[in-house]
Interface confidence: low
């Protein structure tokens, strides 16, 4: 799917197929957008 802005968190998390995904204990975050939240 085509994304809205990087502010559209749901889209960033579920639609950006070109982002490497990293699993954390709490949630999945897109690596490269910022440090995973603890």
């Amino acid at each position: 799917c085509s994304c809205s802005s990087l502010m559209d968190k749901e889209c960033v998390y579920f639609c950006h197929l070109d982002i490497i995904w990293v699993n954390t204990p709490e949630h999945v975050v897109p690596y490269g957008l910022g440090s995973p939240r603890s």
Partner: antibody, heavy 121, light 112 residues
Framework: QVQLVESGGGVVQPGRSLRLSCAAS????????MHWVRQAPGKGLEWVAV????????YYTDSVKGRFTVSRDNSKYTLYLQMNSLRADDTAVYYC??????????????WGQGTLVTVSS | DVVMTQSPLSLPVALGQPASISCRSS???????????LNWFQQRPGQSPRRLIY???NRDSGVPDRFGGSGSGTDFTLKISRVEAEDVGLYYC?????????FGGGTKVEIK
Amino acid sequence: QVQLVESGGGVVQPGRSLRLSCAASGFTFGSYGMHWVRQAPGKGLEWVAVIWYDGSDEYYTDSVKGRFTVSRDNSKYTLYLQMNSLRADDTAVYYCARDGYRTRGNYFDYWGQGTLVTVSS
Amino acid sequence: DVVMTQSPLSLPVALGQPASISCRSSQSLVYSDGNTYLNWFQQRPGQSPRRLIYKVSNRDSGVPDRFGGSGSGTDFTLKISRVEAEDVGLYYCMQGTHWPPTFGGGTKVEIK
């Protein structure tokens, strides 16, 4: 009409703190991500930080990570930038700018007038 | 981060004459959705920046049609068809394809 008004700038000594505010009006503040962008005297524009529309996430340029914190109060239509451990190279005009809503890459469609932060002993 | 390089640094131009500013990116700005997220901003003396162009060639509302954007991939251009006195100031390109957003160093347009 969309309006963004920054405040809180001033002269501060190295190592001290300052909190900037950006009062928004003319749009549904809680639907938009918000950025801080700065401009050192005589220099170009540098993106500093961003906060999600709902305040759930924020990201920073490397040079301010661990020192600056962006936050927002959607009920007050206000964006904040808490600046700690200030350094001389943080001296700049700080602008708040709105992110586009549901349009990827639609950054900075509206800007405030800026507030000057001078870090000097 | 993507590096944005603008040229020239300074652009003296006579009133009524055309002006052209170049912007090059260190990586392609074509996103996977096919769009190219390249914006242009104007900063008049003593004022805050104002967005002129988004997605390479789309003018923001209220922007005169003498401003036009073009380009693709890594090479972009802002053209002013006939420079007016109010066009004096700094012009910045900015990419929004890759995170974080990055700006060019700016081009100063002045009247000669």
